[in-house]
């Protein structure tokens, strides 16, 4: 009669939870049986993010830290089942935790928009295009962002208009701008559940131009033209 290792009821155990579950929530469980009828002690291996704990008696798996889908889903760990007593033989199975997205990332600018400029003085109202993004999952359709100016005082000088779900146009309302940098605050709403807003800043410089680029004294790099 040869002592055999515990046998898991499945090769892979899979569970699905919302990424915003409270710490201490049961997120899944695993089961194994020992051919000799011995008790099983369960443990986790490879919990690199430190998100989980397993009850070594019941095989229930609990969250011990905030989960984050954007860090990667599914989250894969190994579960070890060890005989209690006997020869302490063990077996390994996989536990895959699929994290369902919660709208928990505010919109932001899709790239670095430093270096935006208009040649001063403006001969006509100008505009530039910018793009927004966020790190949440957008199933079946892309993001549907809405855009507005971040403060009422900006409305005399600027207007923002939506191009599509991710892009918008920032336009000047007149041509009477000083030769300096203006920081334009843009409010971006993702329309999610719950809706999240991000307020981003677009630095726009009005500068004297030489051959279509901002003139800077020696030692300063030329800005790129964005309008």
């Amino acid at each position: 009669d040869v002592n055999e290792a515990p046998q898991f009821s499945q090769h892979v155990f899979q569970a699905k939870v919302s990424e915003d579950v409270a710490i201490g929530t049961k997120v899944g469980n695993v089961t194994a049986k020992d051919p000799e009828g011995l008790d099983i002690s369960y443990s986790l291996r490879g919990d690199t993010r430190g998100w989980l704990k397993i009850d070594h008696v019941t095989g229930e798996i609990f969250s011990v830290a905030p989960l984050d889908r954007e860090a990667g889903s599914p989250y894969r760990v190994q579960v070890v089942a060890t005989e209690v007593g006997g020869s302490s033989l063990s077996s390994v199975s996989e536990f895959h935790l699929i994290l369902m997205d919660v709208n928990d990332n505010p919109p932001r600018l899709a790239k670095d928009y430093t270096g935006l400029f208009f040649c001063h003085p403006l001969s006509a109202p100008g505009s530039l295009i910018f793009e927004a993004t966020d790190d949440d999952q957008h199933l079946f359709r892309g993001p549907h962002f809405t855009f507005s100016l971040g403060s009422g005082s900006l409305q005399n000088d600027w207007e923002v208009s939506k191009i599509n779900g991710t892009h918008a146009r920032l336009s000047t309302r007149h041509t009477e701008f000083e030769e300096r940098e203006y920081v334009v605050l843009i409010r971006i709403n993702d329309g999610g559940r719950p809706p999240l807003e991000g307020i981003v800043s677009l630095p726009v410089t009005f500068c004297s131009c030489v051959e279509g680029s901002c003139f800077r004294p020696a030692g300063h790099k030329h800005h790129h033209h964005h309008h």
Partner: antibody, heavy 117, light 108 residues
């Protein structure tokens, strides 16, 4: 005969720690999980946690997870529980128990802990 | 956590009477992991019934256990004086293991 022999009664000050023992005889400690249970007249029986002496795997009731530490010394066939930051609410009888298939088939006689200044 | 509620808190019976005590769980419990313990004053609990209906070694056959899901019971077909004790149910289907608050059996 399978027995679990627990250490004697303790009188401790609030804020202090207590460490009690549970010595197994008649079987090898590493053959079963050891559980600890608190009993008070008001709260009845409360499971504190369990340890598998074979490899140190342990599980705790979240209520006790910050203050209770379960350990074993397999060379002396003894399990230990330490509780820290004691308050009057920790005054109780603490039992160790052996489990098989998740039922507690052998219990120690209990260690009485009184927390008082 | 699964809360176990026992009723009645106290039951008083004459020798020879049939007694039933119940244990209800706030969520479903596997019958494999539902136990009953007997405790007499000044003593530690003793395993009495395990896996819902199996009598522990040395427990008289007048005791029986039954139930499933969220409702379990312990029955004594013909109470004897030595049965005077407090009986606790326990679930270990889900962690943390939890106990009922006990039913005290008094003999008239």
């Amino acid at each position: 005969e399978v027995q679990l022999q627990q250490s004697g009664a303790e009188l401790v000050r609030p804020g202090a720690s207590v460490k009690m023992s549970c010595k197994a005889s008649g079987y090898t400690l590493t053959s079963n999980n050891i559980h600890w249970v608190k009993q008070t007249p008001g709260q009845g029986l409360e499971w504190i946690g369990a340890i598998y002496p074979g490899n140190g795997d342990n599980s705790y009731n979240q209520k006790f997870t910050d203050r209770a530490i379960l350990t074993v010394d397999t060379s002396s066939n003894t399990a230990y529980m330490q509780i820290s930051s004691l308050t009057s609410e920790d005054s109780a009888v603490y039992f160790c128990a052996r489990s098989f298939r998740r039922y507690f088939d052998v219990w120690g006689a209990g260690t009485s802990v009184t927390v008082s200044s | 956590d699964i809360k176990m509620t026992q009723s009645p808190a106290i039951v008083s019976a004459s020798p020879g009477e049939k007694v039933t005590m119940t244990c209800r769980a706030t969520s479903s419990v596997s019958s494999s992991y539902l136990q009953w313990y007997q405790q007499k004053p000044g003593s530690s609990p003793t395993l009495w019934i395990y896996s819902t209906s199996n009598l522990a070694s040395g427990v008289p056959s007048r005791f029986s256990g039954s139930g499933s899901g969220t409702s379990y019971s312990l029955t004594i077909s013909s109470v004897e004086a030595e049965d005077a004790a407090t009986y606790y149910c326990q679930q270990y289907s889900s962690s943390p293991s939890t106990f009922g608050s006990g039913t005290k059996l008094e003999i008239k």
